[in-house]
Each structure stands twice: as C-alpha cells, then as structure tokens.
C-alpha cells in the first residue's frame, strides 16, 4: 500500500475509497475517542505524517444516508 498520502494525492485517495458521498478531514465529533478533551485526530495526521491503509481512509468517509423505506 502507499507509504504516505498528502495534498492532492490524499484527496484523490479519499474520493476513490469513499466515492462521491464525500469525506471528512477530521473525524466527526464523538467519533472514536470518549474523552471530550482529547485532541481531534485528522486524516492528515494519520495518513500524511505517517502511513495509513485502506481501513484508515474508510474511517473518514461521510456516512451513507439511510435507505428509503419500502
């Protein structure tokens, strides 16, 4: 997999992984850490300053909207 992803490469990678539904650069509030004082981790920290994998990228995808009811 990639070593690190920064700038346009990171954006292209996120679009590829998430599709057109979009993505966050920071995890949504309340995502992951239970501590309110914990510094927010962003994708740049996780994938540009160090290497990350597909699973890590997927964590920053915007959620799917709920399926329409039958």
């Amino acid at each position: 997999g990639p070593e690190t992803l920064c700038g346009a490469e990171l954006v292209d990678a996120l679009q590829f992984v998430c599709g057109d539904r979009g993505f966050y650069f920071n995890k949504p509030t309340g995502y992951g850490s239970s501590s309110r004082r914990a510094p927010q981790t962003g994708i740049v920290d996780e994938c540009c300053f160090r290497s990350c994998d597909l699973r890590r990228l997927e964590m920053y995808c915007a959620p799917l909207k709920p399926a329409k009811s039958a």
């Epitope: 990639p2 292209d12 990678a13 679009q15 590829f16 599709g19 539904r21």
Partner: antibody
Framework: QVQLQQLGAEVKMPGSSVKVSCKAS????????ISWVRQAPGQGLEWMGG????????KYAQKFQGRVTITADKSTSTAYMELSSLGSEDTAVYYC?????????????WGQGTLVTVSS | DIQMTQSPSSLSASVGDRVTIVCRAS??????VNWYQQKPGKAPKLLIY???SLQSGVSSRFSGSGSGTEFALTISSLQPEDFATYFC?????????FGQGTRLEIK
Amino acid sequence: QVQLQQLGAEVKMPGSSVKVSCKASGGTFSSYAISWVRQAPGQGLEWMGGIIPTLGIVKYAQKFQGRVTITADKSTSTAYMELSSLGSEDTAVYYCAGGPRGYSYNFDNWGQGTLVTVSS
Amino acid sequence: DIQMTQSPSSLSASVGDRVTIVCRASQTISRYVNWYQQKPGKAPKLLIYAASSLQSGVSSRFSGSGSGTEFALTISSLQPEDFATYFCQQTYSPPITFGQGTRLEIK
C-alpha cells in the same frame, strides 16, 4: 487521451485462475484510476474493484473479496486483474475502465474487453 | 450496496421519437449518477455524468435529470445510431453499481 488495450480472449478450466491485463498508452497513466467491470453474456455490468496505480490503493467489491487481486505495474503502465477459483458463472467479458483521479468512477475510457470462457 | 433499478427493461421507438429511461436508487445518492450507451460487441460509452452533465463529444440530444433517488435519461429525437442498450451507474458509494440496462430497439 489515454487508450486502454486488452487482449482478446482466454479459455480456462473450472477451478483455475485467470490474469487479465490492461495496458495504457498515449497518455498519463498516473492521472487515472482503473476499475474492472465484467459483463456476463447478455447481462448487465458488474464492478469488481479498482486501483489508483500510482498510489497503490486498491478497493474490491465485497462479492469478489478474497477471489480477485487487482495490481498495477507503473513501469509498463499496465493494470492487472486476477480472478481465482473460476466457475462457469465467471464466463464474461472483463473490461478495464478508467476514470480521472478525483472522479475515479466516471468511466470515460474503456478497454475493448477480454472474453474469459470457463469450460472443461 | 446501493441497488439501481432501471425501467423499462426494453423499449421500442421510431427515429425522431423522444424517449425517456428512468433509474431509481435504493437510497438517496444526491446527483451521483452516470449514464452509458453500449452497442453489441462494444464497450460502454459515457454519455452523462453527475446526473445532468454532458460528457465531452456526446450529442446534445442526450440529457439527464434527477436527484435523490430518481433519475432520467432523455433522448430528444432518436437517430438510427441511438438504438443500443443504456445503463445507469451510481458513483455515490463503492461498491459501484449499475442498473440492469434498457434495450432500445427500432419499432
């Protein structure tokens, strides 16, 4: 513009594997994401997975996870799709399809397709 | 996975007719739908992307509309070369999925 070139046909035995190639020429391989899409005879289109060749990021459809491997060789501008444990239901035309990076799934560029026939 | 349902599955029409093909998504996908044309023995060709944007080099008689879960491809005045199979595709979220196709035949 990039042209995607595929070989014509392969005949494989059930249980074997096939490796299909897709060579890009006449443009910048690095500016594309490559997906693999198959079409069984008389049927619709089915996305198998894709790769951004220069970044080495690969994403697979769950249906094919564990049975398909998508790779790319930057030095030859060639993408590959290997499908294992072939069965008769895998008989199909396998297309590589390119989308510009940032618009990975807008397939504005297609190979001519490789017909894979699985038969004993 | 997001299901894309196309209707009708086949359609007979005459040269000069205006035809519309509909595609419905199993969940809301904003405007992230593409339309392709495929002729026998050939690879698909991108006609419309992002629901309504015309791909470069494609005739302006093709147009796309819709958002959310319902999308349409319209051919304003059928030409002989338009008789083919048409597929919709969602790019909103992998796995990328396609409609089952609409075969457009000469009446």
